[in-house]
């Protein structure tokens, strides 16, 4: 906490420019009104404070709103976001969608802070519901955040936001979230022809049921070994040894080096060792 | 503010159907949120009974899914539960409740007696 | 569906102690889990959501904590309004289940 002192003759801000870069932290204390500081805060972030300089602007804040900052304000506090905790944002109420795109930009690249998932979670909760240009600007700036969702909040997903989701974005879906977003992506492509379709399909496999596979057994896919690794086991079970030739195409000699792991291990029990056979990779049922 | 207000009636006899309604007040129910009907028996414990999301889809709980359903009248921003077949079990505190990620606004609740 | 086991049953404690009431779930739910405290004739009232983000209005000597199937509801320095019943309830996938309730009793 910084002593109070009187600002020193000719030291009052008048605004907030390059100059107040100069002041010790005292003097920033003493010498800029929050007032000024509030509707100014655009200005802070082209001026290169210290970070000290940064926690007297941020304490000056505080004392002038101390039931959680206006939305005027949390719109330009650029660099001064990161100074916040996750209970100085649990005071905000943000409901533009401009004002969480300005803070994320400014933590854009970086991991999730508890400070943005505070923001995020609250401004989702403020709105009742995530709305597709909330969902596409949340995805832009964290690509696994539609992992981060339940199957439950999954389950309002729009199938048009589907569109611009990448297979990396899926990486740390679980069965139970695939199983909802499956159909969306299902509905979302099911316009594109054949092969196009499986290219976009693909990431979401993981939410298939038997039906859908043995479709696309018929349409010479090619799946690789990594996709079949993640397909629903209770789908993959009743899929016959020809279906899964089909399937995999030439990538069905992998089956060998994952005859121990699921869904392999337990297709391979439910099979006629004489269809088996056919394959000519010693799998054993 | 939000506000939610159970009504109904006290006292159903076995067997017969069970409607309650909740009048929303500070926001429309079409808007945003889930919007649920919750359970407390005399012994305090809880159950989630169903909700009617903002844009009308529904889900119920499958203990209850044979016997349940939930509508809404958005004219009137208000939500119903009807419980068909009920039983003494089906005594209990019942109160409905808006919700995102976390059950945030609450009813007073209606107490409700399954007697004959 | 994900059953809730909440521990301990009660609890009693003095004014200003540290109480930790936990949550296990049977399945993993992220950190979709919140709590809730409830006062003898009242409604229940959300006190943290999303695993330990504190409602609006809520002290901050509560604190939410856990992922996955492990969660804590820590109280301290206990006020006399903190005395009632505290519940978990997940939010993963419906059906939504509720613990089974921690009596919170003045010592």
């Known amino acids: 906490e910084v002593e109070k002192t009187a600002c020193p003759s000719g030291k009052k801000a008048p605004e907030i420019d390059e100059s107040l870069i100069f002041y010790k932290k005292w003097e920033l204390e003493a010498c800029v009104d929050a007032a000024l500081l509030a509707t100014q805060m655009d200005r802070v972030n082209a001026i290169p404070f210290t970070y000290e300089q940064l926690d007297v602007l941020k304490h000056k804040l505080d004392e002038l709103y101390p039931q959680g900052y206006p939305e005027s304000v949390i719109q330009h506090l650029g660099y001064l976001f990161l100074k916040m905790s996750p209970e100085d944002i649990r005071k905000w109420n943000v409901t533009s969608l401009e004002t969480l795109k300005a803070l994320l930009e400014v933590n854009k690249g970086h991991e999730m802070s508890p400070q943005v998932a505070t923001l995020i979670d609250r401004f989702v909760k403020g709105r009742g519901q995530l709305d597709k240009d909330t969902l596409d600007t949340l995805t832009a700036f964290y690509p696994g955040y539609l992992c981060s969702l339940s199957p439950e909040e999954l389950s309002s997903v729009p199938p048009s936001s589907i569109w611009a989701v990448r297979p990396q974005d899926l990486d740390t879906c679980d069965p139970r979230q695939l199983d909802v977003l499956y159909p969306k992506a299902r509905l979302a492509f099911q316009n594109m022809n054949g092969s196009e379709y499986f290219v976009k399909i693909q990431s979401f496999l993981g939410g298939a049921p038997t039906e859908d596979l043995k479709a696309l057994s018929q349409q010479n896919v090619s799946m690789d070994l990594a996709t079949f690794m993640k397909l629903r086991t209770d789908a993959v079970l009743p899929l016959t040894v020809a279906e899964v030739q089909k399937l995999l195409g030439p990538h069905v000699e992998g089956l060998k080096a994952e005859e121990r792991h699921r869904p392999v291990r337990d297709w391979i029990l439910r099979q006629r060792q004489d269809d088996l056979d056919t394959l000519g990779l010693g799998l054993q049922g | 503010d939000v506000q939610l207000q159970e009504s109904g009636p006290g006292l159903v006899k076995p067997s017969q159907s069970l409607s309650l309604t909740c009048s929303v007040t500070g926001y429309s129910i079409t808007s945003g949120y889930y919007w649920n009907w919750i359970r407390q028996f005399p012994g305090n414990k809880l159950e989630w009974m169903a909700y009617i999301r903002y844009d009308g889809s529904n889900n119920y709980n499958p203990s209850l899914k044979n016997r349940i359903s939930i509508i809404r009248d958005t004219s009137k921003n208000q939500f119903f539960l009807r419980l068909n077949s009920v039983t003494t079990e089906d005594t209990a505190t019942y109160y409905c409740?808006?919700?995102?990620?976390?059950?945030?606004?609450w009813g007073q609740g209606i107490s409700v007696t399954v007697s004959s | 569906d994900i059953q809730m086991t909440q521990s301990p049953a009660s609890l009693s404690a003095s004014v200003g102690e540290t109480v930790t009431i936990t949550c296990r779930t049977s399945g993993d739910i992220h950190n979709y889990l919140a709590w809730y405290q409830q006062k003898q004739g009242k409604s229940p009232q959300l006190l943290v959501y999303k695993a330990k983000t504190l409602e609006n209005g809520v002290p901050s000597r509560f604190t939410g904590s856990g992922s996955g199937t492990q969660f804590s509801l820590k109280i301290d320095s206990l006020q006399p309004e903190d005395f009632g019943t505290y519940y978990c309830q997940h939010f993963w996938t419906t059906p939504y289940t509720f613990g089974g309730g921690t009596k919170l009793e003045i010592k």
């Open positions: 409740a808006k919700s995102y990620y976390g059950m945030d606004d």
